[in-house]
């Protein structure tokens, strides 16, 4: 069963799935100026059996100007920069998550993919949160969210995480300010939702975010 909506948004935090449950769909979206090859499916699908899971179908993008060819164009330096975070492969993926039965790893990048990935999660999926560079975590509980089915409807549990600016007066649990809806926040703040291919250690993530801030997309 697909989750009806997205994981909750926490101001100044990113979320990430360490592994994707079977049934998860990933849209094959291409960056501007490129399109999916005509024969290609619109999705990658995490499928498998009890012993092995993998992504069905491969996403491929071709230049919009080239009608009947799948010739790939090498990204320009600025294009490489904008996708830098997506393309990082971390050696730090926890073994227990990556090798979970019935789960797929993060799919490798494909040439000229869009700067955000659009995932469609399934019930039982867990995502993990951490604060972006310049903010520190005040935990009241687990910094994770799970898609659950209750009374025939899907919902994400609320992660117990507050990200506070290091230079601000500390905001302690119990003093939490009301959160504005995601659409109510300024665009610059919304775009702080950054997701890497795998969680990096904080310093590595901070360094990355100085050069590239964008959202890896989930839906």
């Amino acid at each position: 069963e697909l989750c009806d909506d997205d994981p909750p948004e926490i101001p100044h935090a990113t979320f990430k799935a360490m592994a994707y449950k079977e049934g998860t769909m990933l849209n094959c979206e291409c960056k501007r100026g490129f399109r999916r090859i005509k024969s290609g499916s619109l999705y990658m699908l995490c499928t498998g059996n009890s012993s092995h899971s993998s992504w069905d179908n491969q996403c491929q993008c071709t230049s919009s100007a080239t009608r009947n060819t799948t010739k790939q164009v090498t990204p320009q330096p600025e294009e490489q920069k904008e996708r830098k975070t997506t393309e990082m492969q971390s050696p730090m993926q926890p073994v227990d998550q990556a090798s979970l039965p019935g789960h797929c790893r993060e799919p490798p990048p494909w040439e000229n993919e869009a700067t955000e990935r659009i995932y469609h999660f399934v019930v039982g999926q867990m995502v993990y949160y951490q604060c972006v560079q310049g903010y520190r975590a005040l935990h009241r509980g687990p910094a994770e969210s799970v898609c659950k089915m209750t009374h025939g409807k899907t919902r994400w549990t609320q992660p117990q995480l507050i990200c506070t600016g290091e230079m601000e007066t500390s905001q302690f649990p119990g003093e939490e300010k009301p959160q504005a809806s995601p659409e109510g926040r300024p665009e610059s703040e919304t775009s702080c939702l950054v997701t890497t291919t795998d969680f990096q250690i904080q310093t590595e993530m901070a360094a990355t975010m100085e050069t590239s801030i964008f959202t890896t997309e989930y839906q």
């Epitope: 009806d4 979206e29 619109l42 179908n57 700067t115 955000e116 659009i118 997309e217 989930y218």
Partner: antibody, heavy 115, light 107 residues
Framework: QVQLVQSGAEVKKPGSSVKVSCKAS????????INWVRQAPGQGLEWMGR????????NYAQKFQGRVTITADKSTSTAYMELSSLRSEDTAVYYC????????WGQGTLVTVSS | DIQMTQSPSSLSASLGGKVTIACKAS??????IAWYQHKPGKGPRLLIH???TLQPGIPSRFSGSGSGRDYSFSISNLEPEDIATYYC?????????FGGGTKLEIK
Amino acid sequence: QVQLVQSGAEVKKPGSSVKVSCKASGGTFSRYIINWVRQAPGQGLEWMGRIIPILGVENYAQKFQGRVTITADKSTSTAYMELSSLRSEDTAVYYCARKDWFDYWGQGTLVTVSS
Amino acid sequence: DIQMTQSPSSLSASLGGKVTIACKASQDINNYIAWYQHKPGKGPRLLIHYTSTLQPGIPSRFSGSGSGRDYSFSISNLEPEDIATYYCLQYDNLLFTFGGGTKLEIK
């Protein structure tokens, strides 16, 4: 609960343009995929195109390429579909729908093209 | 573009009975098919996606099956509120295409 609310009915002259809006509530609009579909009187459903607001990516059906423009305003959680060079055969009910399998639909907007 | 051939275009059945609608794609659509119920003056309603996944809140009287190019949709134990036009949609390929629709009437 996700809701898509569309703008009201329009009467247009041939050769003019129409812009239909679709305001979303519930969920995170920028992460939506918004599709536009139309149904002419006595006809079936016809996909026109889609937009992914956070990507700024639009895709259009070949039939409408060059005549339809789909946009989105993240600040107001609203998607728009503009159809230009209207002709009488564009008289139809226009719908917006979420996701690629159209899980939630707007109530529809009747556009009448008549001289 | 992928063509979706839906049959029959109309059908009539008795209350409590069962009906089946077929959709044939012009190429393999990898199970990415959805089924909708459309009543006059309303927006269509998603019943089933990914061939057989029932949308939350949709009764189990509705079901879907198929693979490759051939797919079917059934309603059992027909009720008066099932009177509507039903459409299939392929969403495997970005140029999404609907079937021509099946108008269901109750005898």
